[in-house]
């Protein structure tokens, strides 16, 4: 995984760190999975499981891998070219307006409403008024009459942090 190369032509403080694989930048940029050295002469590989870069870049630091929070499951691990993919656990979801935490899905709809959408990792159950068919949004008052729902299947990531 590592390639030791000598760089006698470089200023002494810019020589290669032996534990990291290096290549040369192309037009001042380094490929995904790398960052640029501070003298601009080398592309240094990110550390698997610790940091990453997704695009051609001139980053001085690779980006830190996201750690999934409790209440989240890791769909795919962090690689040198892709951040960790985290998803809310079954029965919970993450809203766009509160992306920092997974919230519990409602167990059913209020009286006079019917469920038309299941709980998914990225959305709560969806309720509509029986007659009008208009969606219900916002906090639910005390549920008097509920229609039970099974948690949605975690099919795809609800957030790609990073």
């Amino acid at each position: 995984e590592s390639a030791l190369i000598t760089q006698q032509d470089l200023a002494p403080q810019q020589r290669a760190a032996p534990q990291q694989k290096r290549s040369s930048p192309s037009e001042g940029l380094c490929p995904p999975g790398h960052h640029i050295s501070e003298d601009g002469r080398d592309c240094i590989s990110c550390k698997y499981g610790q940091d990453y870069s997704t695009h051609w870049n001139d980053l001085l630091f690779c980006l830190r891998c996201t750690r999934c929070d409790s209440g989240e499951v890791e769909l795919s691990p962090c690689t040198t070219t892709r951040n960790t993919v985290c998803q809310c656990e079954e029965g919970t979801f993450r809203e766009e307006d509160s992306p920092e935490m997974c919230r519990k899905c409602r167990t059913g709809c209020p009286r006079g409403m019917v469920k038309v959408g299941d709980c998914t990792p990225w959305s709560d159950i969806e309720c509509v008024h029986k007659e009008s068919g208009t969606k219900h949004s916002g906090e639910v008052p005390a549920v008097e009459e509920t229609v039970t729902s099974s948690p949605g299947t975690p099919a795809s990531p609800c957030s790609l942090s990073g």
Epitope: Q13, A17, G28, E38, D39, G40, N57, D58, L60, F61
Partner: antibody, heavy 117, light 108 residues
Framework: EVQLLESGGGLVQPGGSLRLSCAAS????????MSWVRQAPGKGLEWVSA????????YYADSVKGRFTISRDNSKNTLYLQMNSLRAEDTAVYYC??????????WGQGTLVTVSS | EIVLTQSPGTLSLSPGERATLSCRAS???????LAWYQQKPGQAPRLLIY???SRATGIPDRFSGSGSGTDFTLTISRLEPEDFAVYYC?????????FGQGTKVEIK
């Protein structure tokens, strides 16, 4: 011989702005990442900001994020630090330094920024 | 962020004596990104050691650096009058870059 020469420091009121410059010579400026490091009177060194050789990537200490902007003009071999919304705690000698992560191998003589009413 | 703690805060020694300065990191840092600087009053810092143990250009061999992981040491084998100054360690492993608070080496 590598030389870094800062300018632009001075006395400014809280909330005011100042732009520091660092003229570089003696090395291929556009290839190297550059930094600003500051030192409050009688205190230790604090890294402030860094920029990649092309200027495409910039980094800031939390204490200055959103208020300071680092930039460079490679055609003029000059590094800049635009400082806005200045506070009393920003009072320090500001050094321009060559390098970022491995080391700061060359430093300017520093320019004093005093934030006071 | 990685916090670097230097000890002792002040070291009182006589010329000719050996000085041992410590720099401890709050989490592991790469040796490739650990440097030491010397600063005298009214002057800019000067790079002494980079990569934990490599001497910068023009630095006398009485200065040496060692260590890995979280514990690093700067040793001045035999203090010269011009070595009395403040010494800082610095890490560049993770953003933000951080310095230790400094160790002052003063004449006893």
């Amino acid at each position: 011989e590598v030389q870094l020469l800062e300018s632009g420091g001075g006395l400014v009121q809280p909330g005011g702005s100042l732009r520091l410059s660092c003229a570089a010579s003696g090395f291929t400026f556009s290839s190297y990442a550059m930094s600003w490091v500051r030192q409050a009177p009688g205190k230790g060194l604090e890294w402030v900001s860094a920029i990649s050789g092309s200027g495409g990537s910039t980094y800031y200490a939390d204490s200055v994020k959103g208020r300071f902007t680092i930039s460079r003009d490679n055609s003029k071999n000059t590094l800049y630090l635009q400082m806005n919304s200045l506070r009393a705690e920003d009072t320090a000698v500001y050094y321009c330094a060559k390098g970022v992560r491995v080391s700061f191998d060359y430093w300017g003589q520093g320019t004093l920024v005093t934030v006071s009413s | 962020e990685i916090v670097l703690t230097q000890s002792p805060g002040t070291l009182s020694l006589s010329p000719g004596e050996r000085a041992t300065l410590s720099c401890r990191a709050s989490q592991s840092v790469s040796s490739s990104y650990l440097a030491w600087y010397q600063q005298k009053p009214g002057q800019a810092p000067r790079l002494l050691i980079y990569g934990a143990s490599s001497r910068a250009t023009g630095i006398p061999d009485r200065f040496s650096g060692s260590g890995s992981g979280t514990d690093f040491t700067l040793t001045i084998s035999r203090l010269e009058p011009e070595d009395f100054a403040v010494y800082y360690c610095q890490q560049g492993t993770t953003h933000p870059i951080t310095f230790g608070q400094g160790t002052k080496v003063e004449i006893k």
